[in-house]
Interface confidence: low
């Protein structure tokens, strides 16, 4: 089953209302509004390509972590080709850096670079060259990174510009859950995905109504992977005597049918010379004057 995403931060959906911090104050990153497809879109942009030694930071607002253990960061951005500037702008770069910092409280406007840990250098797959730009055809790049395990109450992300011409159009931060699942007649609850790729969270399932773990069988278990996918089912539940599997549930045998043990088999029609069974029968009684030997299976007809 596909992982479920729980969004913690969505810059594009906020309509420019988030008010992220820029550092140093009054330099570098700037919030801009553009009209695209007749809709206003907001972006953070920086383009100090002519001046060397750029160190401009953009920090998100404090994000409450909640139950997230590993977060995923999806960035949509576009980068201009350094060759589109006068003299190729010798100090121009085509990458920027992504950082994060965990904290138990919101530091507000108190920004300290030393608290941030680098996640990665973000490089575009495609750069926007002059001809594209003049035609307003910007090359949109999508990059995703993940960080975990997170342990504090919340976190910040930060973007460091080192002299590129970048427009950051979307920043989406989310965590993943393995969705509620019915499999093998067992119910598995919605589960927060683990934080470490090698370790899979083991989740015990509970048998659905009228299902049981067969004698000697393994309890139902599944593993919730980091990406929110359920993996490696172990064990199973079977419909108990008098019930058969219909889709993901156990349904009582219809009148005139029976099932004598917990198994994968469906309900069987009552054999010859038996009385009509009620709903949910585990066996069919013999008609008067007809009998079965004690060792005979319930599926055997009754005889005189």
């Amino acid at each position: 089953a596909q992982g479920k995403e729980v969004v913690l931060l969505d810059f594009a959906a906020a309509g420019g209302e988030l008010g992220w911090l820029t550092h140093p104050y009054g330099k570098g990153w700037d919030l801009m509004q553009n009209i695209m497809n007749d809709m206003p879109i907001y972006m953070y942009s920086v383009c100090n390509v002519m001046s060397g030694d750029q160190d401009n930071w953009l920090r998100t607002n404090w994000v409450y972590r909640g139950e997230a253990e590993r977060i995923f960061i999806e960035l949509k951005f576009t980068v201009r080709d350094c060759n589109s500037f006068p003299g190729g702008a010798s100090s121009c770069k085509e990458t920027f850096n992504l950082y994060y910092a965990e904290s138990d409280l919101d530091y507000g406007t108190n920004f300290q670079k030393r608290l941030f840990t680098k996640i990665d250098t973000i490089a575009p797959d495609e750069i926007t060259v002059s001809s594209d730009f003049e035609a307003r055809h910007v090359k949109l790049n999508v990059e995703e990174r993940s960080v975990g395990p997170l342990t504090r109450k919340g976190f910040y992300l930060a973007f460091q510009d080192i002299g590129a011409c970048v427009a950051l159009l979307s920043v989406r931060v989310y965590y993943k859950k393995c969705p509620e699942l019915l499999q093998g007649l067992a119910h598995f609850p919605e589960t927060i995905a683990g934080s470490d790729a090698p370790s899979l969270a083991t989740v015990a399932g509970t048998c659905v109504d009228h299902a049981v773990v067969p004698p000697g069988g393994e309890e139902p278990r599944m593993h919730c992977a980091v990406d929110g996918e359920w993996l490696v089912p172990i064990g199973q539940c079977l419909c108990q005597a008098g019930y058969e599997k219909v889709e993901d549930a156990c349904q009582a045998c219809s009148p005139g049918f029976f099932k004598f043990e917990a198994s994968e088999s469906p309900c069987l029609e009552c054999p010859e010379h038996t009385l009509p069974s009620p709903e949910g029968a585990t066996s069919c009684e013999c008609e008067e004057g007809f009998f079965r030997a004690p060792q005979d299976p319930a599926s055997m007809p009754c005889t005189r």
């Epitope: 330099k27 801009m32 509004q33 001046s51």
Partner: antibody, heavy 126, light 112 residues
Framework: QVQLQESGGGLVQPGGSLRLSCAAS????????MNWVRQAPGKGLEWVSY????????YYADSVKGRFTISRDNAKNSLYLQMNSLRAEDTAVYYC???????????????????WGQGTTVTVSS | QSVLTQPPSVSGAPGQRVTISCTGS?????????VHWYQQLPGTAPKLLIY???NRPSGVPDRFSGSKSGTSASLAITGLQAEDEADYYC????????????FGGGTKLTVL
């Protein structure tokens, strides 16, 4: 038509304060960065301050840093310059001008200050 | 003392061609920053005359042209007319300065 109109100038004593305003009309004010530029009597143009469209980026000339504060109210289509601790050398005609700074779309500033107000006179004298 | 250097004055007879220079350095014009030119008629606010080194805003006659080379830029006016008598300012950006914006000291053009 596109227009900028300054107001708030006047005579003030050294150490005093003034607040200049610039009312914009005829264009989408919230999409443009703005500047204040001044011109002392008989002298050339001197750039004073810059504010980006969203107020997130602000610059000042070294000569006014710490004394002047630029701000804007996009809902009112207005630009302001709060001038404190005024000195005799701040005496000038103050102009507001529409402008763009480097960003992804302009690449680098190549539009210049394309719209100017008519100016307001500030005289600092005892 | 301006970061961009302009001659204090130039003059020419009607119909003549005059040029006004604007000399910078490697941290401004020489770094690839654009140069803009403004005209200030007596008693009026400055008006954008040339932007992005050589572009004319609509309404500016083609008698005015701009160019840039190395660390310098120049404004040329051909077919000089009496109404061209004004102060002319170049403007660029300097990566070494707070706020970047720099003006030349201005040149007074006199039409003889």
């Amino acid at each position: 038509q596109v227009q900028l109109q300054e107001s708030g100038g006047g005579l003030v004593q050294p150490g005093g304060s003034l607040r200049l305003s610039c009312a914009a009309s005829g264009f989408t004010f919230s999409s443009y960065s703005m500047n204040w530029v001044r011109q002392a009597p008989g002298k050339g143009l001197e750039w004073v301050s810059y504010i980006s469209s969203s107020s997130s980026t602000i610059y000042y000339a070294d000569s006014v840093k710490g004394r002047f504060t630029i701000s804007r109210d996009n809902a009112k289509n207005s630009l302001y310059l709060q001038m404190n601790s005024l000195r005799a050398e701040d005496t000038a005609v103050y102009y507001c001008a529409r402008y763009r700074l480097p960003d992804f779309w302009s690449g680098y500033p190549n539009y210049g200050m394309d719209v100017w107000g008519q100016g307001t006179t500030v005289t600092v004298s005892s | 003392q301006s970061v961009l250097t302009q001659p204090p004055s130039v003059s020419g007879a009607p119909g003549q061609r005059v040029t006004i220079s604007c000399t910078g350095s490697s941290s401004n014009i020489g770094a690839g920053y654009d140069v803009h030119w403004y005209q200030q008629l007596p008693g009026t606010a400055p008006k954008l005359l040339i932007y992005g080194n050589s572009n004319r805003p609509s309404g500016v006659p083609d008698r005015f042209s701009g160019s840039k080379s190395g660390t310098s830029a120049s404004l040329a006016i051909t077919g000089l007319q009496a109404e061209d008598e004004a102060d002319y300012y170049c403007q660029s950006y300097d990566s070494s300065l707070s706020g970047h914006v720099v003006f030349g000291g201005g040149t007074k053009l006199t039409v003889l």
